[in-house]
């Protein structure tokens, strides 16, 4: 049966049998800035081009043991959520991965900046169709990272990022706080904000919308056919990147403002239990859960 | 995220140092009264002191970025400090990434074309 997260973002008409928009997102390239990935996993083989870009800090700790499957875990799962054959949102989207996070899931602002610059240069050298950049990472507020995101957005690139898993105001983190970036918080199958250990999804006025981010089934780097459940605002952001890819594939001329407006328009409204958020943040936090456009747009989104 | 709202630095730390046109004979000294600012991550464990992103003013050309980076290295060397230019940015933001002692920040903030300097910091998978 269809995983809960795909059901949640799917218009009712498409829930009958299985989630399968045959060519969703095929005109769009999604850049993923994350860990290394297992690009020949059955779920994503042929869909992800691993670029030669790598800018990561050394792993912490003298006894750190670099295990390939662990190094690839986060990125492989997210690539699967965006474009996986069976558990992906935009099954037609092609992806390019840049390694900016090490085997412990840690990177630097400077490495991320250089990665964003790499994408801009690639765009200039070989202009393609619409570009979506997925940034499933967060650090403290960074003026320079936000500025780079702003420049890339002004160059016509759609940036989607994780709100952060700190149960805190997303405005205190980057790139979540960058106004031009689509910032995504995480909700669960009960439309509750996701709790992650003692923390959970970030919130506040810098969040644009929420998306499924708990117990998300996706490609596991443990083996070439394995699946695993992961949770976090990265998974939520990956859903929105997939939805954005499908929207842009259907309407390649959409501006960032129009895309943002459509994402909000088609979202489920007022389904999130706001009691989870601090009282002063409830009015500031958007009560929106991302979804694909309804069946009236069949010709556009499910061609 | 969330367009149409003012930028809020939260508890982001900003240290403003007024530029002074003094030593080192700055051939391209900045206009009087402009300031370059220094920024670092408010979350101490995430800071990466010793690596800095020097962001130059918007219209700065690549050749000027390279020249500014070389100038910083030369001025640092005169003070007995080793520096390493790790990357020169162009395409998105003009500037460069430099590995250097924090002692050189005041010097770096006085360089021509400098808009602001940010200490590198960590980001994490979410």
């Amino acid at each position: 049966s269809i995983p809960w997260n795909l059901e949640r973002i799917t218009p009712p008409r498409y829930r009958a049998d299985e989630y399968q928009p045959p060519d969703g997102g095929s005109l769009v390239e999604v850049y993923l800035l994350d860990t290394s990935i297992q690009s020949d996993h059955r779920e994503i083989e042929g869909r992800v081009m691993v670029t030669d870009f790598e800018n990561v800090p050394e792993e912490d700790g003298t006894r750190f043991h670099r295990q390939a499957s662990k190094c690839d875990s986060h990125g492989t799962h997210l690539a699967g959520v965006v474009s996986g054959r069976d558990a992906g949102v935009a099954k037609g989207a092609s992806m390019r991965s840049l390694r900016v996070l090490n085997c412990q899931g840690k990177g630097t602002v400077s490495g991320t900046l250089i990665g964003l610059e790499f994408i801009r240069k690639s765009q200039l050298v070989q202009p393609v169709g619409p570009l979506v950049v997925l940034l499933p990472l967060a650090g403290g507020y960074s003026r320079v990272l936000n500025a780079a995101c702003q420049r890339l957005a002004r160059a016509g690139v759609v940036l989607v990022t994780a709100a952060g898993n700190f149960r805190d105001d997303a405005c205190l983190y980057s790139p979540a706080s960058a106004p031009e970036v689509i910032t995504v918080g995480a909700t669960n199958a009960q439309d509750q904000p996701v709790t992650l250990g003692t923390l959970g999804t970030n919130f506040g006025r810098c969040v644009d919308l929420f998306a499924p981010g708990e117990d998300i089934i996706g490609a596991s780097s443990d083996c070439s056919t394995c699946f695993v459940s992961q949770s976090g605002t990265s998974q939520a952001a990956a859903h929105v990147a997939g939805i954005a890819a499908m929207m842009l594939s259907a309407e390649p001329e959409l501006t960032l403002a129009e895309l943002r407006q459509r994402l909000i328009h088609f979202s489920a409204k007022d389904v999130i239990n706001e009691a989870w958020f601090p009282e002063d943040q409830r009015v500031l936090t958007p009560n929106l859960v991302a979804a694909l456009p309804p069946s009236t747009h069949e010709n556009l989104y499910f061609q | 995220g969330a367009m149409g709202q003012e930028d809020e630095d939260g508890d982001y730390e900003e240290l403003v140092l007024a530029l002074r046109s003094e030593e080192d004979g700055l051939a391209e000294a900045p206009e009087h009264g402009t300031t370059a600012t220094f920024h670092r991550c408010a979350k101490d464990p995430w800071r990466l002191p010793g690596t800095y992103v020097v962001v130059l003013k918007e219209e700065t050309h690549l050749s000027q970025s390279e020249r500014t980076a070389r100038r910083l290295q030369a001025q640092a060397a005169r003070r007995g400090y080793l520096t390493k230019i790790l990357h020169v940015f162009h395409g998105l933001l003009p500037g460069f990434l430099v590995k250097m002692s924090g002692d050189l920040l005041e010097l770096a903030l006085k360089l021509p074309h400098v808009d602001y300097i940010e200490e590198d910091s960590s980001v994490f998978a979410q």
Partner: antibody, heavy 115, light 109 residues
Framework: QVQLVQSGAEVKKPGASVKVSCKAS????????ISWVRQAPGQGLEWMGW????????NYAQKLQGRGTMTTDPSTSTAYMELRSLRSDDTAVYYC????????WGQGTTVTVSS | QSALTQPASVSGSPGQSITISCTGT?????????VSWYQQHPGKAPKLMIY???NRPSGVSNRFSGSKSGNTASLTISGLQAEDEADYYC?????????FGGGTKLTVL
Amino acid sequence: QVQLVQSGAEVKKPGASVKVSCKASGYTLTSYGISWVRQAPGQGLEWMGWVSFYNGNTNYAQKLQGRGTMTTDPSTSTAYMELRSLRSDDTAVYYCARGYGMDVWGQGTTVTVSS
Amino acid sequence: QSALTQPASVSGSPGQSITISCTGTSSDVGGYNSVSWYQQHPGKAPKLMIYEVTNRPSGVSNRFSGSKSGNTASLTISGLQAEDEADYYCNSYTSTSMVFGGGTKLTVL
């Protein structure tokens, strides 16, 4: 263009081993593994397993477990399939194909096991 | 796991349409979006005709189409031509491996 070129035909005695090679070209190697499929005379296709160019990981069909070994050599863009303790019912055409999707196939290698 | 079930043979006249079925279980055909169809002429390597249930690789005639309902996938060939005479195999993911159908011999009368 994307191509998989296999080694030539082999005749082996029962109990011996055979190693078939498959040289890949025209695409990004690490984006796909290699599947191995065999076809006995007059029979259908049988998936034998898969091997990764990215990290050398393997996924063998249950029937093959223990008797077969699949490897890759990224430096020469070549995948290998070795089958040990050959029996007469291993006589077949052995194909390599790109990835699990098997969208591109090698020309096939005939392996005859006969005393 | 056992092979997917296909009819041993089907036939049709030039210009007609034929459909080949491929029946599995919820653990293979019914559980995945990844059913493929291959055409194999005698003495040749198989050729991919349909992938991921409905998609046609570039270069494959639009006379070939795929579909799926529940645990059964189907390949339809419209406007039969003499060169379509061949063996056809379906293939599906299973949880950890891949499984082929037994094959269907298509005869163009």
